[in-house]
């Protein structure tokens, strides 16, 4: 057993039918030694009495806040929650597992830039009784600072009979370079409790390998004079690291026909234009990717070819 | 150390060409390393990122964009110098940069070389014959320390009497192919931003 | 105690189906995950399906994705495994099973699989 | 499609100590715990070690498992006439949990 904040402690368990449990004492916060009792959640069920309850948890119905009385008097709570361990694995029944980049992804992390700053996002299907914690640090073993505010709800989808819920977070590293050479990962914790349940998710990374672009901007075509080319042109989006000359992106122009089984035509530059044939009904894409280091494209920013 | 000697040099910054190899050299090296060795921990997850230039160069400091230098974080363990002379800097471009930057890349350049080389010696030596070193990628390293054009001291390569450890030879390769990479990253940005200037 | 007692199994035609059901006393049923694995005659374990305490998530061997479906029914402390386009290679005992570190199994069901 | 390996059959006779090996590789048995089970002809499984090295109530002493990187053993110290059965090894792949993944089986014969 173990403190996650004041007054709310997690029992964890091995979790199998007819496990023994673990033996628990809870010790009532009062300097008072006499009449005192304990009851469980809502119930005024007396469960004993005494300065100090030995339970023994073994399920959830054993899990809950304790509270202890004297003369109708509360004297102090304590929450017991419970952490799954299945077979030697800490149940991730809360979150869903989002399968990419690889199975068991509960955590998904992006960063627009080399500041410092990213977000991070998980799913689940629960929609009530539903609190979240996020800690992050640079390395675990003598940990550098990185802030992180609280967990938001960030979207709502409907997939088949089921609601999906995304949840989402932003940090920053307290100190950041953006040329620096990370050695050291970030590491990302989140507590979550549904109910009387915890469970416990982490994320380790380095900003390098979470980059993600945002689209390019200003995104124009100038037809050229007696020709079916036209020249594109863009600009690297705001949100980028500067000096763009040190922290250089390679972009991927395509032409798409309207219908998705056209062959799209797809060009890489370094520059920021490229010249290409527009079709008609087309629309032309461009997106960004760091030009050094291989992490994800930004998404496409797009413009008809009419 | 000697100081590099300017060569002018009227055309692009020849070091750029020179650097893009250097990367897609050892990014498929990595690349290789990582599917021929699947069964050693060779992923970015898997591996200690150790850089062997610790302590010895300061390239990331040395080589920081000028907008970069008013971000406190960044200036830790900066060492400024404004000497800018260099092979790889056409003269008249040479006020934005510093010959310590330079210098310590082509540092970075032999430490990792006389690495590589070793590790080759060694894994030459495996019965198994699994994976040796891109002499390609040996190739680019020795360009781009030329076109650099420093003269230094050369550090002899390591030589070591008892018998080799494939399996730790193998992981090491890992780490310095990761580590390398990364750097090689670096320097590109630097010659890219050079280029700019 | 813990019991799980199987039913279900018996002989079918190749390309036909057949529902299997292990039946759980003795244990708060709908608080834990739930296996079914096989044995093919004269060979060894292979896990088939699994199921999470609410049913919520359900994970197939690659072998039988697509033709079995793996279902419990809380209330009555049944699990299922419902099995269509049998193939003569699924001919073997099944069993189920409890998840957890130590776990409790069936008696096991043969199901085979002829023409 | 078996990812743990196991040696097909080892002997022993009565009173010698008796070791399966079970190899797996970094993604499983190096980043789960491991399980091993006894088969006696026509019955279920039963459990004797989980969590690499500990012996449910019940499963005699003799029996002791152990884990070291990417493999696991299981041995049998004083073998008996009624430890003659098929052992399976199981442990988990971290990619594909709550998958179990089982060992291809070890026949034990006690002889003599």
């Known amino acids: 057993i173990w403190e996650l904040k004041k007054d709310v402690y997690v029992v964890e368990l091995d979790w199998y039918p007819d496990a023994p449990g673990e033996m628990v004492v809870l010790t009532c916060d009062t300097p008072e030694e006499d009449g005192i009792t304990w009851t469980l959640d809502q119930s005024s069920e007396v469960l004993g009495s005494g300065k100090t309850l030995t339970i023994q948890v073994k399920e959830f119905g054993d899990a809950g806040q304790y509270t202890c009385h004297k003369g109708g008097e509360v004297l102090s709570h304590s929450l017991l929650l419970l952490h799954k361990k299945e077979d030697g694995i800490w149940s991730t029944d809360i979150l869903k597992d989002q399968k990419e980049p690889k199975n068991k992804t509960f955590l998904r992390c992006e960063a627009k830039n080399y500041s410092g700053r990213f977000t991070c996002w998980w799913l689940t299907t629960i929609s009530t009784d539903l609190t979240f914690s996020v800690k992050s640090s640079r390395g675990s073993s003598d940990p550098q600072g990185v802030t992180c505010g609280a967990a938001t709800l960030s979207a709502e989808r409907v997939r088949g009979d089921n609601k999906e819920y995304e949840y989402s977070v932003e940090c920053q590293e307290d100190s950041a370079c953006p040329a620096a050479e990370e050695s050291l990962p970030i590491e990302v914790m989140v507590d979550a409790v549904h109910k009387l349940k915890y469970e416990n998710y982490t994320s380790s990374f380095f900003i390098r390998d979470i980059i993600k672009p945002d689209p390019p901007k200003n995104l124009q075509l100038k037809p050229l004079k007696n020709s079916r080319q036209v020249e594109v042109s863009w600009e690297y989006p705001d949100t980028w690291s500067t000096p763009h000359s040190y922290f250089s992106l390679t972009f991927c122009v395509q032409v798409q026909g309207k219908s998705k089984r056209e062959k799209k035509d797809r060009v890489f530059t370094d520059k920021t234009s490229a010249t290409v044939i527009c079709r008609k009904n087309a629309s032309i894409s461009v997106r960004a990717q760091d030009r050094y280091y291989s992490s994800s494209w930004s998404e496409w920013a797009s413009v008809p070819c009419s | 150390r000697n100081l590099p000697v300017a060569t002018p040099d009227p055309g692009m910054f020849p070091c750029l060409h020179h650097s893009q190899n250097l990367l897609r050299a050892v990014s498929n090296m990595l690349q290789k390393a990582r599917q021929t060795l699947e069964f050693y921990p060779c992923t970015s997850e898997e591996i200690d990122h150790e850089d062997i230039t610790k302590d010895k160069t300061s390239t990331v400091e040395a080589c920081l964009p000028l907008e970069l230098t008013k971000n406190e974080s960044c200036l830790n363990s900066r060492e400024t110098s404004f000497i800018t002379n260099g092979s790889c800097l056409a003269s008249r471009k040479t006020s934005f940069m510093m010959a310590l930057c330079l210098s310590s890349i082509y540092e970075d350049l032999k430490m990792y070389q006389v690495e590589f080389k070793t590790m080759n010696a060694k894994l030459l030596m495996d019965p198994k014959r699994q994976i040796f070193l891109d002499q390609n990628m040996l190739a680019v390293i020795d360009e781009l320390m030329q076109a650099l054009n420093f003269n230094s001291e050369t550090v002899p390569q390591k030589s070591s009497l008892e018998e080799p450890d494939f399996y730790k030879t193998k992981i090491k390769l890992c780490i310095l192919l990761h580590a390398f990479r990364i750097r090689a990253v670096t320097i590109d940005r630097v010659m890219s931003y050079l280029n700019a200037s | 105690q813990v019991q799980l007692v199987q039913s279900g199994g018996g002989v079918v035609q190749p390309g036909r189906s057949l529902r299997l059901s292990c039946a759980a006393s003795g244990f708060t049923f709908s608080s834990y995950g739930m296996h079914w694995v096989r044995q093919a005659p004269g060979k060894g374990l292979e896990w088939v399906a699994f199921i999470r305490y609410d049913g919520s998530n359900k994970y197939y061997a690659d072998s039988v994705k697509g033709r079995f479906t793996i279902s419990r029914d809380n209330s009555k402390n049944t699990l299922y495994l419902q099995m269509k386009s049998l193939r003569a290679e699924d001919t073997a005992v099944y069993y189920c099973?409890?998840?957890?570190?130590?776990?409790?199994w069936g008696q096991g069901t043969m199901v085979t699989v002829s023409s | 499609s078996y990812v743990l390996t196991q040696p097909p059959s080892v002997s022993g006779t009565p009173g010698q100590r008796v070791t399966i090996s079970c190899s797996g590789g970094r993604s499983n048995i190096g980043s789960n715990s491991v399980k091993w089970y006894q088969q006696l002809p026509g019955t279920a499984p039963k459990l004797l070690i989980y969590g690499n090295d500990q012996r449910p109530s019940g499963v005699p002493d003799r029996f002791s498992g152990s884990k070291s990187g990417t493999s696991a053993s299981l041995a049998i110290t004083g073998v008996q006439a009624e430890d003659e059965a098929d052992y399976y090894c199981q442990s988990y792949d971290r990619g594909t949990h709550p998958a179990l993944l089982f060992g291809t089986g070890t026949k034990v014969t006690v002889l003599g």
């Open positions: 099973k409890t998840h957890g570190s130590h776990d409790n």
